[in-house]
Every structure is written in structure tokens, then in C-alpha cells.
């Protein structure tokens, strides 16, 4: 009598994650009587995948009706494949007994699973940094197979070179992850800038996956301060303005000090945006010259985004103000941008 053969015609099968995989197996003879079982892996640690007689295998179905008389086809279909299903599958014939005895194994079919990378997630620094500082952005993507993948960083369309990328694990695995860090030098013009992490993989239909981050979340542009005096009004009041320009984000508190005493505090809100994404703000203070005998030292104190206050001082020369209406003023701007 001819020796029974267990035929697994495919040495290897490749499927996309989420699809079904058909693993073919036929036997050359109906005898001896006994069941067929499917295993993943060989040796004592092998994993039972399908046993017609018993067990619950929700994702595995027989391609042919194995209960049919004279059935010699024991192919199976595994649905909703994941990278964790990769491995070598063996169709094994047993001789009926108590217990059943393993008789013959097929040569095995290697199941390879191709899986797409997840959408890249880009995260920026936890705290804002000022222009001319370097910040790090991180990009992560997971669950892809095979391991080969390319990742590129762009800032406003220009590829970044200060990049460190790792694909894990280093050895053989059912699926892989990529993590990349890009260092970006901030400039005052970067409020509207964007960094893009672009991931290309064999499973993607020609279009890389992209993750983005806006530099507006990472940058702080400190303000420029300028204090100026307008001409004296008819009622002996001098209008002094504090121009706070080119700052980001909008969170800003301005305090006027007269001779060191707080005169008024204001919070910036609903400011119009400049073309470059920064903001400007102008605050006015009316000083009644006739109420003062000596010169008045005015200080515009700006606290931006929780940072230490920046001061700009200005002296109004009372002695230079004759008390007639409409006269010109003489003032001295003593200030520089001082930081407390």
C-alpha cells in the first residue's frame, strides 16, 4: 500500500493584515483513519491552530467540508489576519487511537503578514522655547511589517537633516515600530511654520503617511517695547504710549508704573494677527503734568507668557512744560529693555 502523503503545496503565503489567509493541505490517502490537525510551529512548543473535532477556533474555518465522506482536502482559512499570525503552519495527520498518534506532517507553509504603519504621531516640546533656540520633535509609527521603512522630516517643505531614527525591535519580529527625533532651530518667523514627519512603506499605495506639528505650539517670540510721548493736550495732559510689538503667543499683561507705583494693569485679548502670526499691542497712559512738581518716571512693564517682566522707562520732564495750552513737550526717553 502506498505511504500516506500530507501535501502542503505552498512553501510560503503572504497576506495583508486584515485579509484572510488560505493554507492548503491535501492527503494522498483516506487510510489510515484518523484526524488532521493544524499547528503553528514545530516541536513540543507548537500551538494548535485547528482541530475539527474539538475546540473553539473562531477565526479558522475549513475550506472543504471535512465531515464529508472521502474528503481529502483539509485546507483552512484564517480570517482577519494580524502580524501576530505570522509563522510556519503545519498540517499534521494522526492515526486514530487512544490517544491519537501523530503519523505524518506536511512540509509547512510559512505565513508572512504585511501590515501598514499607523498614522505618524508628532509631538513637540513640553514647554515653549524662544527664537534662536533648538527644540526637539518626536514622530512615532507602529505595527508595520516588513521592517523596511523610510521616515523624513520637513520644515515648511524643506527636508531636515538633524534627525535620529530608530526602528524596533532590531531582530526578527511580527511587527515593528519607528521613532524619530528631529531638532529644529526656531526663528522669529516660525509662528506659522509646520514640521511634517513623512513615513513611506511598501504597503502604502505610493503615498507616504504624514504627521504634522505646528511650531506655534512650541515657540515663544518675546516682544519689542517702545515708549513714546505724544504732544501735550490742551488740558495739560501728556499722552504716553507703550508699543509692544512682534510677540507670540498673545498671553501678555502690561502694567504702567508712575514713579514706581502701579497706575494701571491691562491684559491683551482679541488682538489682530500680523502676517507672520505675531501680535502687536499699544497701550496709552495720560499723565496730568499740572499735578506733578517734579519729573515723572513712567515705566511700561510687560509680562509675556509667564516669563520675567520686561521694563521700558520714560521720564516726563515737568519743568519743561510751560502751563500754556498747546505748547510742545520736552521729554527724555531713559529706557532700555530692562529685565527684572
Amino acid at each position: 500500500e502506498e505511504e500516506l502523503q500530507v501535501i502542503q503545496p505552498e512553501k510560503s503565503v503572504s497576506v495583508a493584515a486584515g485579509d484572510s489567509a488560505t493554507l492548503n493541505c491535501t492527503v494522498s490517502s483516506l487510510i489510515p483513519v484518523g484526524p488532521i490537525q493544524w499547528f503553528r510551529g514545530a516541536g513540543p512548543g507548537r500551538e494548535l491552530i485547528y482541530n475539527l473535532k474539538e475546540g473553539h477556533f473562531p477565526r479558522v474555518t475549513a475550506v472543504s467540508d471535512p465531515t464529508k465522506r472521502n474528503n481529502m482536502d483539509f485546507s483552512i482559512r484564517i480570517s482577519n489576519i494580524t502580524p501576530a499570525d505570522a509563522g510556519t503552519y503545519y498540517c499534521v495527520k494522526f492515526r486514530k487511537g487512544s490517544p491519537d498518534v501523530e503519523l505524518k506532517s506536511g512540509a509547512g507553509t510559512e505565513l508572512s503578514v504585511r501590515a501598514k504603519p499607523s498614522a505618524p504621531v508628532v509631538s513637540g516640546p513640553a514647554v515653549r522655547a524662544t527664537a534662536e533656540h533648538t527644540v526637539s520633535f518626536t514622530c512615532e509609527s507602529h505595527g508595520f511589517s516588513p521592517r523596511d521603512i523610510t521616515l523624513k522630516w520637513f520644515k515648511n517643505g524643506n527636508e531636515l537633516s538633524d534627525v535620529q531614527t530608530n526602528v524596533d525591535p532590531a531582530g526578527k519580529s511580527v511587527s515593528y515600530s519607528i521613532r524619530s527625533t528631529a531638532r529644529v532651530l526656531l526663528t522669529r518667523r516660525d509662528v506659522h511654520s509646520q514640521v511634517i514627519c513623512e513615513v513611506a512603506h511598501v504597503t502604502l499605495q505610493g503615498d507616504p503617511l504624514r504627521g504634522t506639528a505646528n511650531l506655534s505650539e512650541a515657540i515663544r517670540v518675546p516682544p519689542f517695547l517702545e515708549v513714546t510721548q505724544q504732544s501735550m493736550r490742551a488740558d495739560n495732559q501728556v499722552n504716553v504710549t507703550c508699543q509692544v510689538t512682534k510677540f507670540y503667543p498673545q498671553r501678555l499683561q502690561l502694567t504702567w508704573l508712575e514713579n514706581g507705583n502701579v497706575s494701571r494693569t491691562e491684559m491683551a485679548s482679541a488682538l489682530p494677527e500680523n502676517k507672520d502670526g505675531t501680535y502687536n499691542w499699544t497701550s496709552w497712559l495720560l499723565v496730568n503734568v499740572s499735578a506733578h512738581r517734579d519729573d515723572v518716571k513712567l515705566t511700561c512693564q510687560v509680562e509675556h507668557d509667564g516669563q520675567p517682566a520686561v521694563n521700558k522707562s520714560f521720564s516726563v520732564k515737568v519743568s519743561a512744560h510751560p502751563k500754556e495750552q498747546g505748547s510742545n513737550t520736552a521729554a527724555e526717553n531713559t529706557g532700555t529693555n530692562e529685565r527684572n
Epitope: 512553501k11 510560503s12 505610493g206
Partner: antibody, heavy 116, light 109 residues
Amino acid sequence: VQLVESGGRLVQPGTPLTLSCTVSGFSLSSYVMGWFRQAPGKGLEYIGIISSSGSPYYASWVNGRFTISKTSTTMDLKMNSLRSEDTATYFCARVGPLGVDYFNIWGPGTLVTVSS
Amino acid sequence: DIQMTQSPSSLSASVGDRVTITCRASQSINSYLAWYQQKPGKAPKLLIYSASFLYSGVPSRFSGSGSGTDFTLTISSLQPEDFATYYCQSWHYISRSYTFGQGTKVEIK
């Protein structure tokens, strides 16, 4: 699933020509498509691909001479200023469902002859 | 660009013979290699993808092996319908470009 190329004909050197690849049985928005050519008695040569979203990529030798574009059911290859060495059978092909590293469906080809 | 060198450029064999065609890449392409069969006046037909995976409907006498730079297509027992030209094709995952070998013509001895 079928691909059919059209537009191939005899043209004079310097003439432009556009080839079309009409697909049926699947959506062009789901697959990368490619153009290839084969000069008489020679081997296969890659021209370029167009991604599922419509971004074209070309072989380095193309140098802007050819342009790949697509609509919902056709992919076009626009060839500027043809030369005698462009005489070839032009094939369109679709990548496999598992990835972009191989082409599993090919059209029968269309012959372009460039001669004065 | 990656160069693909296929050998031999032609071979003569008889029905039933075992035939081996090799393809070498100028740099590693991992397992991104496909094999095609082409008959005169016809379009190429995919045989093997990802270096060793038999495409659906292709007879099991065709097999592929190799990874990195060296690849092999084997026809275990040549049949009359197998007389054709065979091409290898690589895909490079960094440049995302394709390159073909120059072809191997399998003729009847």
C-alpha cells in the same frame, strides 16, 4: 480586472503623443499604477508610477520628457518631443494588493513608432 | 540607481530539465524582488513576488529564493509552455524606484 492601453501610432520625431490606460474592475484611487516600455527585441524599462492619490514619480532618465496623470478610470502618459529611441511597446500595469514592490496585472501594450 | 544583473542572458534546455536563473542587485534590496515571464508579443506575467512567494495561479514548479543582493528563479521541471523570456525586477524601498534585469531567454534545446 483589466487594463487596456491605447494611443500608440506612427509619429514623426519631435511630435508629442499621449497614451491612455483604461482600467476596469477596480478603482484607480486604490492602487499605484505604472508605465513601462520595451523597445523591439530589448528588455523591459520602467518609466514611472502614479500613486493612489495622484502623485507621479519617474525614473531618473525621464528628465521631464514624460508626464503621468490620471482621471477616475484612465491613466495617461504624455510624451513630449518624441525621438526615434522612444520606439517601443508601452505597457501599463497595476501593483499588487500587498504592496508596491511588484506588478500583478498588465495591459497587452500599445506600439509607438517614431520615424520620419 | 540600482543595477540588476541577470544571468545567463540565454539558455537552451529540454522538457523536464531543472532550470536556474540568477539575478544580482548592485546593492541590497532585501526581499523586494519579483520574477516575470514574457512570451513574444505578450505582456509580462508575474510569477514570484517578494523573492519567494508564488503568485496565485502560477504552477508550483516555479520557485524563488534569495534576499539582499542574490536571487534565484528555479523551474523544477521545464514544460513546453515555459519556453519564454524571464525578467527579474527590484524595488528599492529608499529611492522607491524599480529596475529590471536584462532578461533570460529560455529556448528549446
